[in-house]
């Protein structure tokens, strides 16, 4: 329904606090390099303007779209050209092209300094001195580093961040209270960002239908007692919410997400028995809780799928006349019966079913042609099952760090052109699938593992898209969203790769490695491992293990030495020489 003033409408719906927070997130996600103070100034100007529109919706410019208002504001930034280069050209465009232009310039890997956590006392003082600025800075720093972070969910993170400081800055042992909470928020935040990035990639690269198919499958698993019409309504609304957030329409997105949570809670009885606790919570917690809610129990005595989707004489007629509805029903019925399957597997099965019908329906005897379609599903189901079984066995045998290393070697050999930091980041995250999913019983392993791998491989895809270096990565990333993981799994060693020239500097280490955290030290070692494989792609596991063991011993030895720097210099030369000999470099 049309409002005279969109900005007044959203301000009233969301309230001043959420309005300001969301505008800050939006601006920080677009102009990722701008200083905090500049963004705060812009947000305050927009907020004051919104208030004038609330007072009088007919006031000048109040009828303008949010994209026009926000875009005009962003384009007032004086340093736009020198800071962002060609992004400044967006300002010469009219809406909606201008917003599309800003979206295209969002940077998944912005050149920003790593966030260093200050001492707890310093943070608590800053929190007490100016709580509002402290929390705004949190929103700003996360949003600019994660330009697709799900904005209403970031408000939830900020609320938890505030709660952590409120509680812990009064505690006897502030650090013991606060640091685990901040670690948890950081890890959950990274995971949330990556999950949302996949949703946006799905919408932007593969279209609304791809996202809707994903949503039908996931919501049908989660709400197996809900009718298809109910699931379809939720999918339509959820698609609108994510389309808005991924498109930078954060006020509309947050508003519509709140409406969706309200609807779900008002209609719990026809959706899921698991929503009761979620629906008793305040808005931000409620929305988060609904998004994470466990799968409801499957209805008893669900009939066989074959009746409607193989045996019925109307299969082809129903398919041809409304593919979206018929295939949507197939996906819904299959997914609600299979919480043990990953969403991507369910989508592969639906695609196979669709392809079979498209091939068979025009035939002389369609039923004979598609009668065995369910048999075609067996290898598709077994492939991820076997892969997960093998990799969980490997994980249990090696532990997380060495499992990550095995994946580092595997993926560097598959796509050696990819930058070392990207290979390290992606392989480390792929390796986390072990501790995340292998502890689960078989019925939960596949949805945990394969859907998590989809999220991680999407990180590889978005990072690679910024600076494409490998045709194989481009192919796996762009051909099919649901077949990305099987595509990468199927890649063998890249025989066309010309090994990297040996550079001793890459393997020169200094005493600063000794003061790093265990995680940072692992990353240093894993960076060296990737470089080794890039120099010697045909190196065997045994050769690489020997070199890495020597390297670990070298670091341990020199970190215990009195003159660490000298040790690193002298022993490092020996290590490089020994490694070159061992690998035949």
């Amino acid at each position: 329904d049309a409002h005279k003033s969109e900005v007044a409408h959203r301000f009233k719906d969301l309230g001043e606090e959420n309005f300001k927070a969301l505008v800050l997130i939006a601006f920080a996600q677009y102009l990722q390099q701008c200083p905090f103070e500049d963004h705060v100034k812009l947000v305050n100007e927009v907020t004051e303007f919104a208030k004038t529109c609330v007072a009088d919706e007919s006031a000048e410019n109040c009828d303008k779209s949010l994209h026009t208002l926000f875009g005009d504001k962003l384009c007032t930034v004086a340093t736009l050209r020198e800071t962002y280069g060609e992004m400044a050209d967006c300002c010469a465009k009219q809406e909606p092209e201008r917003n599309e232009c800003f979206l295209q310039h969002k940077d998944d890997n912005p050149n920003l300094p790593r966030l260093v956590r200050p001492e707890v006392d310093v943070m608590c003082t800053a929190f007490h001195d100016n709580e509002e600025t402290f929390l705004k800075k949190y929103l700003y720093e996360i949003a600019r580093r994660h330009p697709y972070f799900y904005a209403p969910e970031l408000l939830f993170f900020a609320k938890r961040y505030k709660a952590a400081f409120t509680e812990c800055c009064q505690a006897a042992d502030k650090a013991a209270c606060l640091l685990p909470k901040l670690d948890e928020l950081r890890d959950e935040g990274k995971a949330s960002s990556a999950k949302q990035r996949l949703k946006c990639a799905s919408l932007q690269k593969f279209g609304e239908r791809a996202f809707k198919a994903w949503a039908v499958a996931r919501l049908s698993q989660r709400f197996p007692k809900a009718e298809f019409a109910e699931v379809s309504k939720l999918v339509t609304d959820l698609t609108k919410v994510h389309t808005e957030c991924c498109h930078g329409d954060l006020l509309e997105c947050a508003d519509d997400r709140a409406d969706l949570a309200k609807y779900i809670c008002e209609n719990q009885d026809s959706i899921s028995s698991k929503l009761k606790e979620c629906c008793e919570k305040p808005l931000l917690e409620k929305s988060h809780c609904i998004a994470e809610v466990e799968n409801d129990e499957m209805p008893a005595d669900l009939p066989s799928l074959a009746a409607d989707f193989v045996e019925s004489k109307d299969v082809c007629k129903n398919y041809a006349e409304a593919k979206d509805v018929f295939l949507g029903m197939f996906l819904y019925e299959y997914a609600r019966r299979h919480p043990d399957y990953s969403v991507v597997l369910l989508l592969r099965l639906a695609k196979t079913y669709e392809t079979t019908l498209e091939k068979c329906c025009a035939a002389a005897d369609p039923h004979e042609c598609y009668a065995k379609v369910f048999d075609e599903f067996k290898p598709l189901v077994e492939e991820p099952q076997n892969l997960i079984k093998q990799n969980c066995e490997l994980f249990e045998q090696l532990g997380e760090y060495k499992f990550q290393n095995a994946l580092l070697v595997r993926y560097t050999k598959k796509v050696p052109q990819v930058s070392t930091p990207t290979l390290v980041e992606v392989s480390r995250n792929l390796g986390k699938v072990g501790s995340k999913c292998c502890k689960h019983p078989e019925a939960k392993r596949m949805p945990c593992a394969e859907d998590y791998l989809s999220v991680v491989l999407n990180q590889l895809c978005v990072l690679h898209e910024k600076t494409p270096v490998s045709d194989r990565v481009t192919k796996c990333c762009t051909e099919s969203l649901v077949n990305r993981r099987p595509c990468f799994s199927a890649l063998e060693v890249d025989e066309t790769y010309v090994p990297k020239e040996f550079n001793a500097e890459t393997f020169t280490f200094h005493a600063d490695i000794c003061t790093l955290s265990e995680k940072e030290r692992q990353i240093k070692k894993q960076t060296a491992l990737v470089e080794l494989v890039k120099h010697k792609p045909k190196a065997t596991k045994e050769q690489l293990k020997a070199v890495m063991d020597d390297f670990a011993a070298f670091v341990e030895k020199c970190c215990k030495a009195d003159d660490k720097e000298t040790c690193f210099a002298e022993e490092g030369k020996k290590l490089v020489a020994a490694s070159q000999a061992a690998l035949g470099l």
């Epitope: 006349e321 091939k359 035939a363 369609p366």
Partner: antibody, heavy 121, light 110 residues
Framework: EVQLVESGGGLVKPGGSLRLSCAAS????????INWVRQAPGKCLEWVGI???????FYATWAKGRFTISRDDSKNTLYLQMNSLKTEDTAVYYC???????????????WGQGTLVTVSS | AIQLTQSPSSLSASVGDRVTITCQSS???????LSWYQQKPGKAPKLLIY???KLTSGVPSRFSGSGSGTDFTLTISSLQPEDFATYYC???????????FGCGTKVEIK
């Protein structure tokens, strides 16, 4: 040689009826999905409808109720029965096969030469 | 209503030129169900490309198709004398009854 040959076109008054034929040689029509596509003089192509090998038919929304596609397997011939004709139905009518392996996709590989239908008073 | 919009409606080009024709669909086509046809005066259309980018056998490799969802392109990398014709895109949708063609792009000699 594989070919489709349309016939039955001509001049007809508004409100009248006409039956077009599409005779096949070199292929067995009963194994194919066959479409009718029309093209008004100097205008766009327009899909009319399809008959699958099984005999199931589908029509463009505007053609439902007025146009009927049928097939006589013994004559290896396809038909388009057109009733309640309007001046805007004036066009060249083509029969065309859907690429094997597809049922609902707009991939039409073998075409006849077309037959002209003129609806005029 | 389903719309398949081709642009430009006509263009003039010389032999050897690179020619690009676009086809925009509203809503998006089903599962890349997009085809391109070539039609010469007095003749039936000829299928060049299906599934947005797959070349029909016998069609020269100078023809290529790309795109997905709503935006598609037909490219002729180096126009030959026999390529002067009208080109149509065809789209398939959720319902077979919505099968539609664009209104054509006439490629003329400059």
């Amino acid at each position: 040689e594989v070919q489709l040959v349309e016939s039955g076109g001509g001049l007809v008054k508004p409100g009248g009826s006409l039956r077009l034929s599409c005779a096949a040689s070199g292929i067995d029509l009963s194994n194919y999905a066959i479409n009718w596509v029309r093209q008004a003089p100097g205008k766009c192509l327009e899909w009319v409808g399809i008959i699958w090998a099984s005999g199931t038919t589908f029509y463009a929304t505007w053609a439902k109720g007025r146009f009927t596609i049928s097939r006589d397997d013994s004559k290896n011939t396809l038909y388009l029965q057109m009733n309640s004709l309007k001046t805007e139905d004036t066009a060249v009518y083509y029969c065309t096969t859907t690429v094997p392996g597809y049922s609902t996709a707009p991939y039409f590989d073998l075409w006849g030469q077309g037959t002209l239908v003129t609806v005029s008073s | 209503a389903i719309q398949l919009t081709q642009s430009p409606s006509s263009l003039s080009a010389s032999v050897g030129d690179r020619v690009t024709i676009t086809c925009q669909s509203s809503p998006s086509v089903w599962s890349n169900f997009l085809s391109w046809y070539q039609q010469k005066p007095g003749k039936a259309p000829k299928l060049l490309i299906y599934e947005a980018s797959k070349l029909t056998s016998g069609v020269p490799s100078r023809f290529s198709g790309s795109g997905s969802g709503t935006d598609f392109t037909l490219t002729i990398s180096s126009l030959q004398p026999e390529d002067f014709a009208t080109y149509y895109c065809g789209g398939g949708y959720s319902s077979i009854s919505d099968t539609t063609f664009g209104c054509g792009t006439k490629v003329e000699i400059k």
